[in-house]
């Protein structure tokens, strides 16, 4: 018969034989033969393979380097890589999270639209009319101007995007 040209899922073709791939967490030691199954061995400590494979070496788990502001979010297994994240106040510079940078602060006149996470930076937005921020912060949103009217006061000084309004007493009508 014709030797196979394609194999089933979780198999690979070698020497006209369809051999079983090694399961996740294991590496290939020797190909199958006519009379023997594929030989696979578990990955060692701090190694992994996350797919059905014919790799002869397992991949090393990612190292979360504290010198780069990284820490372990999820410890790797023989089937999964370690997931790193950044220390509090820092976020990843890329999707792979290979290093961290300090969260950005929103300058006066800008408020925090979205607080930073381990993987995303702070998102700032300009304070719209009626709102202000007078601090540089990674957490503070734009605050609404004080409503003088509700306090039976009048605006003595208009607010800006960086300052609150200044309220004062109403002028008394002279008799």
């Amino acid at each position: 018969p014709e030797p196979p040209t394609a194999c089933r899922e979780k198999q690979y073709l070698i020497n006209s034989q369809c051999c079983s791939l090694c399961q996740p967490g294991q590496k290939l030691v020797s190909d199958c033969t006519e009379f023997t199954e594929t030989e696979c061995l578990p990955c060692g400590e701090s190694e992994f393979l996350d797919t059905w494979n014919r790799e002869t070496h397992c991949h090393q788990h990612k190292y979360c380097d504290p010198n780069l502001g990284l820490r372990v979010q999820q410890k790797g297994t023989s089937e999964t890589d370690t997931i790193c994240t950044c220390e509090e106040g820092w976020h990843c510079t890329s999707e792979a999270c290979e290093s961290c940078v300090l969260h950005r602060s929103c300058s006066p006149g800008f408020g925090v639209k979205q607080i930073a996470t381990g993987v995303s930076d702070t998102i700032c937005e300009p304070c719209p009319v009626g709102f202000f921020s007078n601090v540089s912060s990674a957490f503070e949103k734009c605050h609404p101007w004080t409503s003088c009217e509700t306090k039976d006061l009048v605006v003595q000084q208009a607010g800006t995007n960086k300052t609150d309004v200044v309220c004062g007493p109403q002028d008394r009508l002279r008799a």
Epitope: P1, S20, C32, F35, T36, E39
Partner: antibody, heavy 123, light 107 residues
């Protein structure tokens, strides 16, 4: 009944030829690899060769000691295995067993044996 | 070729004894190791395949173990019908090779 029955053994002179037969019954003969194993008087077992099944094209493999002198064939319509032995030597004297070779990738083995037929090579 | 060395070549034992036969391969055979029993004037009979799998119909007093190059056949309680010669056989590489045999005799 599942069985193998050998025939054709006997006395033959060095350099001579002999053909052994093995009649199979009770199983689908063409599905199986079939083998010959021999045993010299008072000695251990020695694999001689095998012929693959229908799915694998009835191709053959031989031990180095018999390669080029012995030929394994099969007639699936008769469920019979053959061993054609040429250029026989004194050291080929043995009981010849026909054996079915079976199993999966988790181990192949000789799981059915005939009763054996004695071949004596002597002048 | 892979050489298979059995030990001992013969042993004497009594009914009820626990008997152990070893088989050593000249290289690792990844558990592709079979055991056969042969009685005088009879054909061999498969007992165990792939190191430890018991062939259908074989009594459970027979067991196999091992890995790499070293394998063992154990008869937990020898019965009168177990006096025979036992052979190991590797099934990983052509040519298939057998051990020299271990003859189990009555003490």
């Amino acid at each position: 009944e599942v069985q193998l029955v050998e025939s054709g053994g006997g006395l033959v002179q060095p350099g001579g030829s002999l053909r052994l037969s093995c009649a199979a019954s009770g199983f689908t003969f063409s599905d199986y690899y079939m083998s010959w194993v021999r045993q010299a008087p008072g000695k251990g077992l020695e694999w001689v060769g095998f012929i693959r099944n229908k799915a694998n094209g009835y191709t053959t493999e031989y031990a180095a000691s018999v390669k080029g002198r012995f030929t394994i064939s099969r007639d699936n319509s008769k469920s019979t295995l053959y061993l054609q032995m040429n250029s026989l030597r004194a050291e080929d004297t043995a009981v010849y067993y026909c054996a079915r070779y079976g199993g999966l990738k988790k181990g192949w083995y000789f799981d059915l044996w005939g009763q054996g037929t004695l071949v004596t090579v002597s002048s | 070729d892979i050489q298979m060395t059995q030990s001992p070549s013969s042993l004497s034992a009594s009914v009820g004894d626990r008997v152990t036969i070893t088989c050593r391969a000249s290289q690792g055979i990844r558990n592709y190791l079979n055991w056969y029993q042969q009685k005088p004037g009879k054909a061999p009979k498969l007992l165990i395949y792939y190191t430890s799998s018991l062939q259908s119909g074989v009594p459970s007093r027979f067991s196999g173990s091992g890995s790499g190059t070293d394998y063992t056949l154990t008869i937990s309680s020898l019965q009168p019908e177990d006096f025979a010669t036992y052979y190991c056989q590797q099934g990983i590489n052509l040519p298939w090779t057998f051990g020299g045999g271990t003859k189990v005799e009555i003490k």
